[in-house]
Interface confidence: medium
């Protein structure tokens, strides 16, 4: 069970990292900035 939980959270972490990498590639420094609106 613990393996399953670890795998699930690691998979989530990998997805988050992939999204961050994508955002950094598309947005550069903007990704860390305040000029962002909904």
């Amino acid at each position: 069970h613990s393996d399953g939980i670890f795998t699930d959270s690691y998979s989530r972490y990998r997805k988050q990292m992939a999204v961050k990498k994508y955002l950094a590639a598309v947005l550069g420094k903007r990704y860390k900035q305040r000029v962002k609106n909904k």
């Epitope: 999204v19 550069g28 420094k29 903007r30 900035q33 305040r34 000029v35 962002k36 609106n37 909904k38």
Partner: antibody, heavy 126, light 114 residues
Framework: QSLEESGGDLVKPGASLTLTCKAS????????MCWVRQAPGKGLEWIAC????????TYYASWAKGRFTISKTSSTTVTLQMTSLTAADTATYFC????????????????????WGPGTLVTVSS | DVVMTQTPSPVSAAVGGTVTINCRAS??????LAWYQQKPGQPPKLLIS???TLESGVSSRFKGSGSGTEFILTISDLECADAATYYC????????????????FGGGTEVVVK
């Protein structure tokens, strides 16, 4: 699709002036409308931007804070109010659009301008 | 804040020739760079964004290249209509909390066509 500025004039030092930017064929929608100026024979100087979506967030160059105010007055009009004008404010004032980058539901500034108006000349002289 | 420095003006070449305009950033801006063309009495016109992406309707004679801190705008097969001042602009935003990314223009480079 075009932008057109108006309101430029010859004014005395210390005066106030409001410039207007009117869009035709472009509805302001989740982009950034900005003002950029150019003193005679000089380069480009950014003044301010406003997000045209519901937040209406405004952004100013550090030197422009307090003396310049950018506003969205309708779905196709943005204004720039200028106070305490000096000779150093003599320039052509351009209205320009930053079309924004949409990512995951957020609109980030693109930090470049794809549409410009022809400009309006402001001369400050006694 | 990022400071953009351009080739001193003017740069000149004959009709049919090639000119290169250099733009240097004071820090790494990856490929976040735009180029504008401005003719006397007219507003700037966006030519290129993201270092090399040509805007719609812009001639393929204009080519942007570079990355990091060094960028080049090359205009080939020069025409009289290319006589103008060219500005680069960092479009990476600002790492400073007290400024924004819109103000990082180069000083401009005038191109004279002989």
């Amino acid at each position: 699709q075009s932008l057109e500025e108006s309101g430029g004039d010859l004014v005395k030092p210390g005066a106030s002036l409001t410039l207007t930017c009117k869009a035709s064929g472009i509805a302001f929608s989740n982009d950034y409308m900005c003002w950029v100026r150019q003193a005679p024979g000089k380069g480009l100087e950014w003044i301010a931007c406003i997000f045209t979506g519901s937040s209406g967030s405004t952004y100013y160059a550090s030197w422009a804070k307090g003396r310049f105010t950018i506003s969205k007055t309708s779905s196709t009009t943005v204004t720039l109010q200028m106070t305490s004008l000096t000779a150093a404010d003599t320039a052509t004032y351009f209205c320009a659009r930053d079309r924004a980058i949409s990512v995951l539901g957020y609109f980030y500034a693109a930090y470049f301008f794809d549409f410009w108006g022809p400009g309006t000349l402001v001369t400050v002289s006694s | 804040d990022v400071v953009m420095t351009q080739t001193p003006s003017p740069v000149s070449a004959a009709v049919g020739g090639t000119v290169t305009i250099n733009c240097r950033a004071s820090e790494d801006i990856e490929s976040f760079l735009a180029w504008y063309q401005q003719k006397p009495g007219q507003p700037p016109k966006l030519l290129i964004s993201r270092t090399s992406t040509l805007e719609s309707g812009v001639s393929s004679r204009f080519k942007g290249s570079g990355s990091g801190t060094e960028f080049i705008l090359t205009i080939s097969d020069l025409e009289c209509a290319d006589a103008a001042t060219y500005y680069c602009q960092c479009t990476d935003g600002s790492s400073s909390s007290s400024s924004y990314g819109w103000d990082a223009f180069g000083g401009g480079t005038e191109v004279v066509v002989k």
